[in-house]
């Protein structure tokens, strides 16, 4: 058993049929010695008396808010949460496996630039009685500071018969140099509590590996005389690291109709303009990627050909 | 500790081309190592990230773009002095700081070159003959060093009398390639910045 935060404790349980469970001793936070009774949650049933209460925690019915009282007055609370371990593996029931980039990916993180700011998000089908707490650091043995905000519900989607909820959090490395060469990864730890179930999820990455630039901005078209060709130009996104001659991007320019199956024109360039063939009812799209370290491509920025 | 704005004219910067070749060569070699050594811990997640140039050179700090010198987090640098007579310095206006940057890059390349050559000698003794260093990568390191053209004492190639542990050597190769790729990215960024300034 360990303390998650003040008056909240996590009991780690091997979860299998007829498991013996864990013996837990609760101590009432009071100078009083006599006349103390214990109850669980809203029940008025007295579970025991005395300054300490010893319980055998085997299942969720044994978890919850234990309260010690004296003469009708509440002295203190202890909330017990369960963390299940099945076949030596901690449960991952609360969050959905996003399966990208690989199986057992529960947390996904992205950074728009090298400033040390990044966003992580996760998915769940649970809508109520759910809380998250996020911590992060650079390295684990001698951790350097990363400050994370509160996790917030950022999107709701309908998937078949189910509703899916996306939560996200923004974090910022306390002293980040955009030009630095990372040797220690960022560690992100998410504590998830659903009702009386506790789970924790972690992700470890280098900022350079989670870079995904914003789409290029200010796309403009200029038809070329006596030609089917169009010159398309754009600018670096505002959120990209500067100077741009140091943090350079490369671009993919594509002309395609509404359907992915339609024919297309495609060209890659390090410049902020390109010449392509425009077709009626097609769009010109441009996306960006770090020129020297191939992490993710940005989303497309698009303009219609006409 | 930072790059000046007054740097060579665009067409006069021979090192840009060589640094692009370097990044390409090390990336290809790393990809080859990951594929060939698929049953060894050779991915970014599996290896320890070590920098053989740590406390010996200060490339990131010495080559910091002017715009980042206002960022306090970028300025916790180690002071290092280098000889300054490189041929990539195509302009007399080139400052001492730029020379410091380029000589730091030269020292990095020299250190990695020695490590890679020592390692290749060991890998050539492996009865499995599983992986060797790409000669193209070694040639590209050499070309960039020649383009930088700094005078510096030659570092003797490390020779080891004991029987090499090939498993350890291959893991060290992965560590070295990962670190060198990251340094090659920095070098490419620096050359691009200098070329554009």
């Amino acid at each position: 058993i360990w303390e998650l935060k003040k008056d909240v404790y996590v009991v780690e349980l091997d979860w299998y049929p007829d498991a013996p469970g864990e013996m837990v001793v609760l101590t009432c936070d009071t100078p009083e010695e006599d006349g103390i009774t214990w109850t669980l949650d809203q029940s008025s049933e007295v579970l025991g008396s005395g300054k300490t209460l010893t319980i055998q925690v085997k299942e969720f019915g044994d978890a919850g808010q234990y309260t010690c009282h004296k003469g009708g007055e509440v002295l203190s609370h202890s909330l017990l949460l369960l963390h299940k371990k099945e076949d030596g593996i901690w449960s991952t029931d609360i969050l959905k496996d996003q399966k990208e980039p690989k199986n057992k990916t529960f947390l996904r993180c992205e950074a728009k630039n090298y400033s040390g700011r990044f966003t992580c998000w996760w998915l769940t089908t649970i809508s109520t009685d759910l809380t998250f707490s996020v911590k992060s650091s650079r390295g684990s043995s001698d951790p350097q500071g990363v400050t994370c905000g509160a996790a917030t519900l950022s999107a709701e989607r309908v998937r078949g018969d189910n509703k899916e909820y996306e939560y996200s959090v923004e974090c910022q490395e306390d002293s980040a140099c955009p030009a630095a060469e990372e040797s220690l990864p960022i560690e992100v730890m998410v504590d998830a509590v659903h009702k009386l179930k506790y789970e924790n999820y972690t992700s470890s990455f280098f900022i350079r590996d989670i870079i995904k630039p914003d789409p290029p901005k200010n796309l403009q078209l200029k038809p070329l005389k006596n030609s089917r060709q169009v010159e398309v130009s754009w600018e670096y996104p505002d959120t990209w690291s500067t100077p741009h001659s140091y943090f350079s991007l490369t671009f993919c320019v594509q002309v395609q109709g509404k359907s992915k199956r339609e024919k297309k024109d495609r060209v890659f360039t390090d410049k902020t303009s390109a010449t392509v063939i425009c077709r009626k009812n097609a769009s010109i799209s441009v996306r960006a990627q770090d020129r020297y370290y191939s992490s993710s491509w940005s989303e497309w920025a698009s303009v219609p050909c006409s | 500790r930072n790059l000046p704005v007054a740097t060579p004219d665009p067409g006069m910067f021979p090192c840009l081309h060589h640094s692009q070749n370097l990044l390409r060569a090390v990336s290809n070699m790393l990809q080859k190592a990951r594929q060939t050594l698929e049953f060894y811990p050779c991915t970014s997640e599996e290896i320890d990230h070590e920098d053989i140039t740590k406390d010996k050179t200060s490339t990131v700090e010495a080559c910091l773009p002017l715009e980042l010198t206002k960022n306090e987090s970028c300025l916790n640098s180690r002071e290092t002095s280098f000889i300054t007579n490189g041929s990539c310095l195509a302009s007399r206006k080139t400052s001492f700081m730029m020379a410091l940057c380029l000589s730091s890059i030269y020292e990095d390349l020299k250190m990695y070159q020695v490590e890679f050559k020592t390692m290749n000698a060991k890998l050539l003794m492996d009865p499995k003959r599983q992986i060797f260093l790409d000669q193209n990568m070694l040639a590209v390191i050499d070309e960039l060093m020649q383009a930088l053209n700094f005078n510096s004492e030659t570092v003797p190639q490390k020779s080891s009398l004991e029987e090499p542990d090939f498993y350890k050597t291959k893991i060290k190769l992965c560590i070295l390639l990962h670190a060198f790729r990251i340094r090659a990215v920095t070098i490419d960024r620096v050359m691009s910045y200098l070329n554009a300034s």
Partner: antibody
Framework: QVQLVQSGAEVKKPGASVKVSCKAS????????LHWVRQAPGRGLEWMGW????????EYAPKFQGRVTMTTDTSTSTAYMELRSLRSDDTAVYYC???????????WGQGTMVTVSS | EIVMTQSPATLSVSPGERATLSCRAS??????LHWYQQKPGQAPRLLIY???QSISGIPARFSGSGSGTEFTLTISSLQSEDFAVYYC?????????FGGGTKVEIK
């Protein structure tokens, strides 16, 4: 499967014209760009131009501008390349090639040998 | 127009050996570079597109790399059916242009 079948070999006199055909099958004809590439005996490949069968748009290499015409007949899924004012150095194998992507060639015809000789 | 130069013109390699073919562009073409194989009496066949992207059905021994002005096609272990002429082609700008080809012959 996607296939391009070209017309047979031709022998032409200098100054004449030649029209080579390329019949497509195994895909919707208007879904692919169509290019013409030639190869002189013992020489490399030379791109001549492209046509979009969907709308008849064309782009020709400057070298052939004014001397080449590329057309398509969507009813028969056939593309045509006509080269005028033939010279002896136009002797080559002429290939049609197609792709959903404009700038490279995924599927090739078997080639048509055009000999220009007096 | 962009001029593509391939080297060497002829490459003599023993079966099972590695072959490295080079292609250089007269100006930077990013990764707009494609590789083809042509056997005598046959049409060319696309091997690699956009410098390094592999094509389904093409053996994994064929790989491409490079960007900017310098590109490489590598055949990791030559098989008898790989002896042919190889062409690179740029798609950075029109007119599309090919290299002069590299003939890979049996040593």
């Amino acid at each position: 499967q996607v296939q391009l079948v070209q017309s047979g070999a031709e022998v032409k006199k200098p100054g004449a014209s030649v029209k080579v055909s390329c019949k497509a099958s195994g895909y919707t004809f208007t879904d692919y760009y169509l290019h013409w590439v030639r190869q002189a005996p013992g020489r490399g490949l030379e791109w001549m131009g492209w046509i979009d069968p969907e709308n008849g748009d064309t782009e020709y290499a400057p070298k052939f501008q004014g001397r080449v015409t590329m057309t398509t007949d969507t009813s028969t899924s056939t593309a045509y390349m006509e080269l005028r004012s033939l010279r002896s150095d136009d002797t080559a194998v002429y290939y049609c090639a197609a792709n959903k992507e404009l700038r490279y060639f995924d599927v090739w015809g078997q080639g048509t040998m055009v000999t220009v000789s007096s | 127009e962009i001029v593509m130069t391939q080297s060497p013109a002829t490459l003599s390699v023993s079966p099972g050996e590695r072959a490295t073919l080079s292609c250089r562009a007269s100006q930077s073409i990013s990764i707009n570079l494609h590789w083809y194989q042509q056997k005598p009496g046959q049409a060319p066949r696309l091997l690699i597109y956009f410098a390094s992207q592999s094509i389904s059905g093409i053996p994994a021994r064929f790989s491409g790399s490079g960007s900017g002005t310098e590109f490489t096609l590598t055949i990791s272990s030559l098989q008898s059916e790989d002896f042919a002429v190889y062409y690179c082609q740029q798609s950075n700008s029109f007119p599309l242009t090919f290299g002069g080809g590299t003939k890979v012959e049996i040593k």
